[in-house]
Interface confidence: medium
Amino acid sequence: CKAMHVAQPAVVLASSRGIASFVCEYASPGKATEVRVTVLRQADSQVTEVCAATYMMGNELTFLDDSICTGTSSGNQVNLTIQGLRAMDTGLYICKVELMYPPPYYLGIGNGTQIYVIDPEPCPDSDF
């Protein structure tokens, strides 16, 4: 297993609809045909997997249909979008990239993107 640098933004603010997007960029040392991207969430020293997808160079990034993540890939960049976020989902979201094939296997883990989610205020009742 060889190390690889992964860069991602330090902070992202989710939209009022609970959607957060960020770019995960990796420094590919070789010409990989298969790349696996995993998003991990770290909160209160607990790490959980949010979503994962594998893609082939020249093809699009596809998450499973029931995933809260969507994304696109372009070269060594992956544009990730996480949906359905609520205030309780605020935390550090870490991008993990694996170059699966061909050998050697490379692994890179970003420093994480702190995603802040603010639940929208409920609309006040209006009397007409």
Partner: nanobody, 115 residues
Framework: QVQLQESGGGLVQAGGSLRLSCAAS????????MAWYRQAPGKQRELVAG???????NYVDSVKGRFTISRDNAKNMVYLLMNSLKPEDTAVYYC?????????WGQGTQVTVSS
């Protein structure tokens, strides 16, 4: 875990055609990509063609216009139709399944193209 079984390989004359099939079983719900790789004697295994769960395909330049990959999700199958075969297409062809937590290979099927 996912298991893959290829079939359809054989001996064919240059200019001929073959259709390879790959049957997937096991945790197939977690597969987003299916692909065919090939490995010629003394060479590294190379990606030939891939198809994702939405049906988007990609091909290595050397087979574009000659090979067609397709996927039947209902039958958990992936196919590789190979037309206008050349001697340099001779190799063991491997089926590949990829997903968030899946990376499986088939056992391979031999394709030999004689001139």
């Amino acid at each position: 875990q996912v298991q893959l079984q290829e079939s359809g390989g054989g001996l064919v004359q240059a200019g001929g055609s073959l259709r390879l099939s790959c049957a997937a079983s096991g945790s197939i719900f977690s597969i987003n990509h299916m692909a065919w790789y090939r490995q010629a004697p003394g060479k590294q295994r190379e990606l030939v063609a891939g198809v994702n769960s939405r049906g988007t395909t990609n091909y290595v330049d050397s087979v574009k216009g000659r090979f067609t990959i397709s996927r039947d999700n209902a039958k958990n199958m992936v196919y590789l139709l190979m037309n206008s075969l050349k001697p340099e297409d001779t190799a063991v062809y491997y089926c590949r399944a990829l997903g968030g937590a899946v990376a499986a290979w088939g056992q391979g099927t031999q394709v030999t193209v004689s001139s």
